[in-house]
């Protein structure tokens, strides 16, 4: 079953290569277990950035080596991606699945264009 997912159109990463955005889903029911996946689309290539599952009201659990962190509040997921560089600029798509209880719902956002600008190196001071 389909579900609506909303996310901001554009986000600018900080000078330290950190970008945050909210992924909001219109839950048709009372989901207790949710899976969130962030995918990056660039040059028609789609790659998985990170994925997490969480029980409603709890922290998101990403893999240990994940570049993502996040928190949840109701039907909103606050996602933070770190370690970004200019080459990582692209469309970051939020995918939400309501895993339990049945029925299973799937929603895919339109994507957040994240712009990353590498900071200029500091000039050497004599």
């Amino acid at each position: 079953k389909a579900m609506h997912v909303a996310q901001p159109a554009v986000v600018l990463a900080s000078s330290r290569g950190i970008a945050s955005f909210v992924c909001e889903y219109a839950s048709p029911g009372k989901a207790t277990e949710v899976r969130v996946t962030v995918l990056r689309q660039a040059d028609s290539q789609v790659t998985e950035v990170c994925a997490a599952t969480y029980m409603m009201g709890n922290e998101l659990t990403f893999l240990d080596d994940s570049i993502c962190t996040g928190t949840s509040s109701g039907n909103q997921v606050n996602l933070t991606i770190q370690g970004l560089r200019a080459m990582d600029t692209g469309l970051y798509i939020c995918k939400v699945e309501l895993m339990y209880p049945p029925p299973y719902y799937l929603g895919i956002g339109n994507g957040t264009q994240i712009y990353v600008i590498d900071p200029e190196p500091c000039p050497d001071s004599d």
Epitope: L39, Q41, V46, T47, E48, I93, K95, L106
Partner: nanobody, 119 residues
């Protein structure tokens, strides 16, 4: 056109095992993910398990965790569901599904294979 064909269903006693297979045909492709869903008569569709190609990462519904194992053979474009310690409540029509990219949703579905667990 991609086709998914399930097999391996049947009738089994509670506590028994079955291995479902889902073969994809119709071209050369690399799926982002493949999974299994089930639907019992008069009940909603339920997610069972899936596996993502990128890291071979698997995910299971709590109701089957520790009893079911999903695996895939990329060379054969086939995904398997090994079901052990079956319970009467596992009785359902089991569907295989595949998604071409992570942002396409479940693009392809099989016709399903019936699993009946008798007590």
């Amino acid at each position: 056109e991609v086709q998914l064909v399930e097999s391996g269903g049947g009738v089994v006693q509670a506590g028994g095992s079955l291995r479902l297979s889902c073969a994809a045909s119709g071209g050369t492709f690399s799926f982002y993910g493949m999974g299994w869903f089930r639907q019992a008569p008069g009940k909603e569709q339920e997610f069972v398990a899936d596996i993502r190609t990128s890291a071979g990462r698997t995910y299971y519904a709590d109701s089957v965790k520790g009893r079911f194992t999903i695996s895939r053979d990329n060379a054969k474009n086939t995904v398997y569901l090994q079901m052990n310690s079956l319970k009467p409540e596992d009785t359902a029509l089991y569907y295989c599904a595949a998604e071409m990219s992570g942002i396409s949703g479940w693009d392809y579905w099989g016709q399903g294979t019936q699993v009946t667990v008798s007590s």
